[in-house]
Every structure is written in structure tokens, then in C-alpha cells.
Interface confidence: low
């Protein structure tokens, strides 16, 4: 049996994945739980097994199809239920009417690469992964650069208010190791949130030429 309050949060990656986290304050002892997705529009349903991520929270990914397939649209409603086994029965622990395009979290940008590096600047590009064609150009990005002796949390955020998959970092220090990350967010959706940060891209600025100020 389960007591206490629960929180059930899910996000759609805009293509073929719904990721869910279920948090339960009460004790959950040796119980198998799953998320069940029943789309109102589609002739399929999907389940995933909730796996513990901490003492009181579980997560799973509903894989709806091939990674780049457009499995849901802006008018879909997906009934999401947390079901936990109680003996031979499944008990509904949480339920929500999930509107995919109101609850978006895209995949982290991929394929970060240095296009051009100099002593004081670096041009970096990236690609978005598994993002719906519905967005067209309605995306924004945040980027951050890790400087020596600082933490990611201290890094100032650079905001790109349009779908621009590159950035030119200025005022860098010559011959210095940096790391760079970027994340993406659609403009659509009341509960939409930022994607995870991309994998860091490490790069080094060129050393200053002796006797020259570049």
C-alpha cells in the first residue's frame, strides 16, 4: 500500500518519447509500478516500467516509435496513468490528461563542434535532435561557457532568441581551455521547459603571437 502525496510529471520530446517522473512521499515496498499512456487519437498505447532514481522517486521513458517519427500532434491528448501492482490487480496511483505540446522538453542539442577558433574568439555550431517540424523556427537557445577556475553554475547565460544553431564567443583569453554547453526550448507550451544541457564541448583558444596583439 502507498500513503502520502505523489507528484507525477511528464514531458514530450516533440517526436516519439515521453519521459515521466513519479515522486511518492509514502513508503513503496517491493511494488512494481508502470506508466501507461493511452492517446485519445492514436490506435496504440504504451507502457514503461518505473525504475527508482532516488528513495522516493521513479522514472521511465515511454518510447512511442522510431526516434524521428512524429507520433503525436498539437491536438492529441494522452491519458497517462501510474499503475502499481497490488496482488493480482493494478491500482491507479496518479492520472493526468497530458497535452504533449503544452509539456515539451526537447532532447539536448548534439554534434557540437568548433567551426573556427582564434585567440580571443571561437565560433561553435550544433544541431537539434529529434525536434518536431511543427516548430519551424520557433525555438530559442541558451548557452554557457566554462572558464578556468569557475563552475558551470557561475557561468553567465547567453540567450539566443531565435533558431540560431551557432554562436561566436568573444573576449576569450588566449591559449586557454574552455568548455561550452547549449540547451534548447520551443516557444510553444504552457509548461514547456528547457532541454537538458548538451554534452560539454572542450576547446582551446589559440595562443597569442609573440609581439602581436590579436
Amino acid at each position: 500500500a502507498v500513503n502520502g502525496t505523489s507528484q507525477f510529471t511528464c514531458f514530450y520530446n516533440s517526436r516519439a518519447n515521453i519521459s515521466c517522473v513519479w515522486s511518492q512521499d509514502g513508503a513503496l515496498q517491493d511494488t512494481s509500478c508502470q506508466v501507461h499512456a493511452w492517446p485519445d487519437r492514436r490506435r496504440w498505447n504504451q507502457t514503461c516500467e518505473l525504475l527508482p532514481v532516488s528513495q522516493a522517486s521513479w522514472a521511465c521513458n515511454l518510447i512511442l516509435g522510431a526516434p524521428d517519427s512524429q507520433k503525436l500532434t498539437t491536438v492529441d491528448i494522452v491519458t497517462l496513468r501510474v499503475l502499481c501492482r497490488e496482488g493480482v490487480r493494478w491500482r491507479v496511483m496518479a492520472i493526468q490528461d497530458f497535452k504533449p505540446f503544452e509539456n515539451l522538453r526537447l532532447m539536448a542539442p548534439i554534434s557540437l563542434q568548433v567551426v573556427h577558433v582564434e585567440t580571443h574568439r571561437c565560433n561553435i555550431s550544433w544541431e537539434i535532435s529529434q525536434a518536431s517540424h511543427y516548430f519551424e523556427r520557433h525555438l530559442e537557445f541558451e548557452a554557457r561557457t566554462l572558464s578556468p577556475g569557475h563552475t558551470w553554475e557561475e557561468a553567465p547565460l547567453l540567450t539566443l532568441k531565435q533558431k540560431q544553431e551557432w554562436i561566436c564567443l568573444e573576449t576569450l583569453t588566449p591559449d586557454t581551455q574552455y568548455e561550452f554547453q547549449v540547451r534548447v526550448k520551443p516557444l510553444q507550451g504552457e509548461f514547456t521547459t528547457w532541454s537538458p544541457w548538451s554534452q560539454p564541448l572542450a576547446f582551446r583558444t589559440k595562443p597569442a603571437a609573440l609581439g602581436k596583439d590579436t
Partner: antibody
Framework: EVQLLESGGGLVQPGQSLRLSCAAS????????VHWVRQAPGKGLEWVGV???????DYNAAFISRFTISRDNSKNTLYLQMNSLQAEDTAIYYC?????????????WGQGTLVTVSS | DIQMTQSPSSLSASVGDRVTITCSGS?????MYWYQQKPGKAPKLLIY???NLASGVPSRFSGSGSGTDYTFTISSLQPEDIATYYC?????????FGQGTKVEVK
């Protein structure tokens, strides 16, 4: 067998309120979205709104300020609360449910209940 | 809102005739639905998802189309087909219906 039975219609004066009921049988309202559709005399069909299986609602913007859809799970019954009624709200009000997949179209309809708004 | 325009608004045909009704959307829609309504009765679903026949519906009814233009056909009109027919889109909210086509027998 899936059945929907509307009730609560009648004659009301302009500005008054009315609550329509839709008793569902053959399925549980926590498993399917149920819609309200209205039809003015001699006119076409107009979608009012829906209450989804989890309890959330979507409305036609034309009605969102005056109409509220709710339900009583224990009675397996849906409601349409209509406030500030006007003559143009005179219509037959139907509740409808889609097939096993809610976008299979409105496969199930009630018989409708007539609301007449007149002084 | 997507406006659905049906044509014709009414038609008269003989038993056995092929009857075609068109429905045009003000914007592109993904799925179209067709209903039959007889006087004093609730609508009855005939076609779902553009071209699929609802359960128990005779095969003389069919639907086709894509984008903004959809067609509903009765291949051989029968006396019991006298009714008003409505198209409906379910691609965006609010859901909208055509104004109806009244089919009569000559």
C-alpha cells in the same frame, strides 16, 4: 452497451442559469472523454467542449466564459452548467463520446435535451 | 477557428443515383468525419478518419480527400438515406462542423 442520457433541459428566461446532466452507462467516465455538442432549431451542429478522462476540460472559446463542464465520477454522470443564457442558446444539447479511440469520431450520442431560452 | 464549408446545401436525387457532397476547410485538416442526421434524431457517425467506415454502416457510403478538400459519396442512393449530412474536422480546437447538406429523393 454504451449509452448516454441527457436531462435537465427546459424553458428558462434570458439571464438565467441551467445545469444539464448526461448519465453514462456501459463505460466509466474516467476512461473516456465526453463532449457536449449543441444544435439550434433548424441549424447545424456546434461543439461546446469536452471533459477528458482525467478530468481536465477544453472549450469552444465562444462558451468558455459562461459554460462549465464537470462530472461526478461516483454517479458516472457529466454536467454542463450554463450561465447568463440568451435566446441564441436555444438548442438541443447532446452529449457524445468517441469510439474506443477518442478520435474515431462521435460514435455514441445521447438523444439530446432541448433548452429553450425565452421571456 | 477552421471553417468547414459544405456544398451543396441541399440536393435532390433519384434512388440508385450516385450522390457526392464536398467539404472544404478554411485551413488544412488531417482527419475528416461524416455524420448522418435524420429529423428528430441524434447524428450518426458514418465515416471516421476521412475514409474509414464506422461499424454497421453500409458500404455504399465512402469518404476521401486530404488537405482542405474532402468528399463524401453515396454510391447508390436508397430511400432510407434521406437525411442531412455533416462533415466535421478534428485537427484543431474548437472542433467544427460543416453547415450540413440536406439530401432528398426525387
Amino acid at each position: 452497451e454504451v449509452q448516454l442520457l441527457e436531462s435537465g433541459g427546459g424553458l428558462v428566461q434570458p439571464g438565467q442559469s441551467l445545469r444539464l446532466s448526461c448519465a453514462a452507462s456501459g463505460f466509466t467516465v474516467t476512461s473516456y472523454g465526453v463532449h457536449w455538442v449543441r444544435q439550434a432549431p433548424g441549424k447545424g451542429l456546434e461543439w461546446v467542449g469536452v471533459i477528458w478522462s482525467g478530468g481536465s476540460t477544453d472549450y469552444n472559446a465562444a462558451f468558455i466564459s459562461r459554460f462549465t463542464i464537470s462530472r461526478d465520477n461516483s454517479k458516472n454522470t457529466l454536467y454542463l452548467q450554463m450561465n447568463s443564457l440568451q435566446a441564441e442558446d436555444t438548442a438541443i444539447y447532446y452529449c457524445a463520446r468517441a469510439g474506443d479511440y477518442n478520435y474515431d469520431g462521435f460514435a455514441y450520442w445521447g438523444q439530446g435535451t432541448l433548452v429553450t431560452v425565452s421571456s | 477557428d477552421i471553417q468547414m464549408t459544405q456544398s451543396p446545401s441541399s440536393l435532390s436525387a433519384s434512388v440508385g443515383d450516385r450522390v457526392t457532397i464536398t467539404c472544404s476547410g478554411s485551413s488544412s485538416v488531417s482527419f475528416m468525419y461524416w455524420y448522418q442526421q435524420k429529423p428528430g434524431k441524434a447524428p450518426k457517425l458514418l465515416i471516421y478518419d476521412t475514409s474509414n467506415l464506422a461499424s454497421g454502416v453500409p458500404s455504399r457510403f465512402s469518404g476521401s480527400g486530404s488537405g482542405t478538400d474532402y468528399t463524401f459519396t453515396i454510391s447508390s442512393l436508397q430511400p432510407e438515406d434521406i437525411a442531412t449530412y455533416y462533415c466535421q474536422q478534428w485537427s484543431t480546437y474548437p472542433l467544427t462542423f460543416g453547415q450540413g447538406t440536406k439530401v432528398e429523393v426525387k
